[in-house]
């Protein structure tokens, strides 16, 4: 049976995708065929076949970026070391080990789901401006994060969530494969408005919050909340 695993990695970091037999295993590299492939995009990540040192079948996206350790393979550790993780690496990776001496039966089959994350920049909230006499507009911008963020606006007077119908979010996939988000909030003009913009990265369980107040161009101190207990508490903790 295929084992299933999940692992997380930050964009730009290195990650190990585990595929290993129990400790104490010994393998002859002239006996095993090892293939690492992606399940969705159907690409060859790396492989080992007996008496063959060239890797001409490896996809260009993974050449020189994905390695198995020969010393590890002798011990039954066929784990993949993936360098400089990119958002495009967020896939299922399949490790398959076949033994020639066992009639090419599967020795090991592991599917590893790689989740990729990147921190969003601290949001920047523009000073409010008035497109009309009875309306105020705020803009919140945050860039270079992954995966796609959630954006919330808060009434900081009572820490309540503003109606999402008041905001218009535009999310861009930038040249690096990361997300940039711009959220525009339109609210009715009141004498004093104290609002905050929160960018939530669900995978990292991280919120970035910045505030803006009418009559004050300087946003409140930036705040980062990590590992909140639940969605409700997460928001409350961030907006205090």
């Amino acid at each position: 049976d295929t084992q299933e695993k999940e692992v997380r990695a930050m964009v730009g970091s290195d990650v190990e995708l585990s595929c290993a037999c129990p400790e104490g295993s010994r393998f002859d590299l002239n006996d095993v065929y090892v293939y690492w492939q992606t399940s969705e995009s159907k690409t060859v990540v790396t492989y080992h076949i007996p008496q063959n040192s060239s890797l001409e079948n490896v996809d260009s996206r993974y050449r020189n970026r994905a390695l198995m350790s020969p010393a590890g393979m002798l011990r039954g550790d066929f784990s993949l070391r993936l360098f400089n993780v990119t958002p495009q690496d967020e896939q299922k990776f399949h490790c398959l080990v076949l033994s020639q001496s066992l009639g090419f039966q599967e020795v090991l089959s592991v599917e590893v789901t790689l989740h990729v994350a990147a921190n969003f920049s601290v949001p920047v909230v523009s000073a409010p401006h008035s497109p009309s006499q009875d309306e105020l507009t705020f803009t919140c911008t945050s860039i270079n994060g992954y995966p796609r963020p959630n954006v919330y606006w808060i009434n900081k007077t009572d820490n309540s969530l503003l109606d999402q119908a008041l905001q218009n979010d535009t999310v861009f996939l930038n040249m690096r494969g990361l997300y940039d988000v711009v959220s525009v909030l339109r609210i009715a003009r009141t004498p004093s408005v104290n609002i905050g913009c929160c960018i939530e990265n669900v995978l990292l369980q991280q919120n970035l919050t910045v505030g803006s107040q009418t009559g004050n161009d300087i946003g409140e101190r930036d705040k980062i909340t990590e590992n909140p207990v639940s969605t409700g508490e997460k928001n409350a903790a961030t907006w205090s």
Partner: nanobody, 116 residues
Framework: EVQLVESGGGLVQPGGSLRLSCAAS????????LGWYRQAPGKQRELVAH???????VYPDSVKGRFTVSRDNTKNTVYLQMNSLKPEDTAVYYC??????????WGQGTQVTVSS
């Protein structure tokens, strides 16, 4: 379990050609590895060709340049084109398909005999 049925084997003279087919009972596009293997009497099973999910191929030196593996996803069939056959290619040829969710499936084999 996926059913695999090989066909196309037979008796051929040295230097001749044969084309083996392996028909699968389900879509072959979901398989990460499609393989052809052979086993001669008294010998262990050996690799003939691996067809990886993206279309890359792997051949042992013994058949490289003579054998070609291919697939037709619309027919759910894998092929092995064998040219310049030699007496030492005589064996039962097996088809194999592997997918993470389905495991490994084997066909029943087809006999290839190269003899004058």
């Amino acid at each position: 379990e996926v059913q695999l049925v090989e066909s196309g084997g037979g008796l051929v003279q040295p230097g001749g050609s044969l084309r083996l087919s392996c028909a699968a009972s389900r879509s072959i596009s979901s398989f990460n590895l499609l393989g052809w293997y052979r086993q001669a009497p008294g010998k262990q099973r050996e690799l003939v060709a691996h067809l990886l999910s993206g279309g890359s191929t792997v051949y042992p030196d013994s058949v490289k340049g003579r054998f070609t593996v291919s697939r037709d996803n619309t027919k759910n069939t894998v092929y092995l084109q064998m040219n310049s056959l030699k007496p030492e290619d005589t064996a039962v040829y097996y088809c194999n398909a592997i997918a993470p969710a389905l495991g490994s499936s084997w066909g029943q084999g087809t006999q290839v005999t190269v003899s004058s």
